[in-house]
Interface confidence: low
């Protein structure tokens, strides 16, 4: 950066050179350069030469003023018209930030993704800081009372086999920059109240042509908890508003959960589960799309790898879309 | 300018107490927890623990949670840590410092308190 | 608690030569983001001075003469060239976890 230059002279900040966005500031510059009574002393903010607002303090400094100073980052340097020199002489340059001191970090959750082998905590930043801003996970054993801390610009992920205290914590999140420092609420939690089942996904959809024709959603899960409660949430693709089934769910076989649906329309399906009684859910699963078929299925054409066909009987989807906007990975 | 002011040398018998100070000037005293170090003559460093101002939340080295009591005092920026049944292994200079940014290293020191036990 | 094992002891040093100083880790101290290892230079009667954080970054205001590096267990400080100014005592320190704990120091000296 502009920092690493040499110097024949010096560059100040006042109140410093990270600030509260929207204060007045002032930048000294003072030469120092052998032979030279400076002129005129000029300032110049990424590159460009400023025009207004600077005072001559003496003979060797100068300052420059401004008020509501906005910009996140701002290189600066100095340079000094010296008698019987052509060109400026460059005094020093500094690098300057604003941005606002952190808010109390909110909304802390802290959640085991079964397999995962680690705890992810997350929570509300606040505002945006504009500056480096660090965040410090405390976690306080309730039974030993020995505290880790973890450092990390955003999110964490803590190994579950550092969590060696026992199974109730607090948790709490610090937030740092060179403005200010908050502390969240205590966040008290207990392990095996945090564990969200393997990621339910469904695999497939077949429509059967009875009486009233059926469609069978196939999904499954790898997880090994024994009591999981699921939601699979289905609408029309023309529908604003989703139609959720419950399910008490035990994934020791794959699941089949029967639709009666209108025919000929463009179905999308997702799913999630929790451990039963349990306070986190899964993040909703990739969007599934399926249409069904008009009252008397014509000819069925074949998606992806799917070899088990009622020929004429059946119409299957294997098909899964990208994340939209009502698809949102929330927990809660 | 971030200044670590500590109080001075202390002689104490074996069994007192002892209580250091350590007055902060130059940023905002409740925004940065306080860490206390410990030098004993000739050895390396100890981490005693820490305070952090707002709350009044500390945090001990297992070491030193029987015997070191860490406090504030927010209305002069000042930070104590007393130390009880005070023994000759006390003996040590004690160090307030402060990070930076939290956890990226004691950019600030106190000068130093020596404590010396002794009959 | 971590324990930071710090070699040599001491060590002397022909003025402009490369002076190396090793910290072990008893475990990780690291993640992708962040080696949670800082260096100290300490002179006699003054307060321990920082001089690398998280391993290799610099701390404002110290000679490019001092360098950090290393990941996960190992970790190392170069000085190079060594000064005259540069005789003191080095320390490694963790802030992996509570408690954060210091390496045993290496006494430089410059022949």
């Known amino acids: 950066g502009i920092t690493n230059i040499n110097c024949s002279g010096h560059i100040w900040v006042e109140p410093a050179t990270i600030f509260k966005m929207g204060m007045n500031i002032s930048i000294y510059c003072q030469a120092a350069i052998k032979n030279c009574q400076p002129r005129k002393l000029h300032f110049y903010k990424n590159g460009i030469k400023e025009r207004f607002q600077i005072t001559r303090i003496n003979k060797t400094t100068a300052r420059l003023w401004y008020k509501n100073f906005l910009e996140p980052h701002a290189s600066m340097y100095c340079t000094a018209e010296c008698p019987k020199h052509f060109q400026e002489t460059l005094i020093c340059g500094k690098d300057i930030s604003s941005g606002y001191p952190p808010d109390i970090p909110d909304e802390v959750t802290c959640v085991i993704y079964e397999y995962s082998g680690n705890m992810t905590c997350t929570w509300n930043a606040g505002k945006l800081t504009y500056i480096d801003t660090k965040y410090v996970v405390h976690v306080k054993s309730l039974e030993t009372e020995e505290e880790q801390q973890y450092l990390t610009s955003s999110y964490i992920n803590i190994s579950t086999d550092s969590l060696q205290g026992g199974k109730k914590y607090l948790v709490w999140v610090q937030a740092a920059n060179a403005l200010g420092m908050e502390e969240s609420k205590q966040l008290q939690i207990h392990l095996d109240d945090i564990v969200i089942p393997s990621a339910a996904v469904i695999s497939r959809a077949e429509t059967i042509n009875a009486t009233v024709p059926k469609t069978i959603i196939y999904w499954d899960s790898q997880t090994t908890i024994e009591k999981v409660s699921c939601e699979m949430r289905y609408k029309a693709t023309t529908n604003q508003t989703w139609n959720v089934k419950e399910f008490d769910t035990n994934f020791t076989y794959v699941q089949q959960s029967e639709f009666y649906l209108e025919p000929n329309i463009k179905y999308v399906f997702q799913v999630r589960c929790q451990e039963t009684g349990k306070r986190y859910w899964q993040p909703w699963s990739s969007l599934f799309f399926h249409k069904t078929p008009e009252t008397v299925p014509q000819v069925t054409s074949k998606a992806f790898q799917h070899d088990t066909w009622n020929s004429g009987l059946t119409v299957a989807s294997i098909s899964t879309g990208h994340l939209t906007s009502d698809n949102r990975g929330d927990i809660g | 300018e971030v200044q670590l002011q500590q109080s001075g040398p202390e002689l104490v018998k074996p069994g007192a107490s002892v209580k250091i100070s350590c007055k902060a000037s130059g940023y905002t005293f409740t925004d940065h927890t306080m860490d206390w170090v410990k030098q004993s003559h000739g050895k390396s460093l100890e981490w005693i623990g820490y305070i952090y101002p707002k709350s009044g939340n500390a945090a001990y080295s297992q070491k030193f949670k029987s015997e070191a009591t860490l406090t504030v005092d927010k209305s002069s920026s000042t930070a104590y840590m007393e130390f009880h049944s005070l023994t000759s292994e006390d003996s040590a200079v004690y160090y307030c410092?402060?990070?930076?940014?939290?956890?990226?290293?004691?950019?600030?020191w106190g000068q130093g308190t020596s404590v010396t036990v002794s009959s | 608690q971590i324990v930071l094992t710090q070699s040599p002891a001491s060590l002397a040093v022909s003025l402009g030569q490369r002076a190396t100083i090793s910290c072990r880790a008893s475990q990780s101290v690291s993640t992708s983001s962040y080696n949670y290892i800082h260096w100290y230079q300490q002179k006699p009667g003054q307060p321990p001075k920082l001089l690398i954080k998280y391993a290799s970054n610099l701390e404002s205001g110290v000679p490019a003469r001092f360098s950090g590096s290393g990941s996960g267990t190992d970790f190392t400080l170069n000085i190079h060239p060594v000064e005259e100014d540069d005789t003191a005592t080095y320390y490694c320190q963790h802030t992996w976890e509570i408690p954060y704990t210091f390496g045993s120091g290496t006494k430089l000296e410059i022949k």
């Open positions: 410092a402060r990070w930076g940014l939290r956890r990226d290293g004691f950019t600030y």
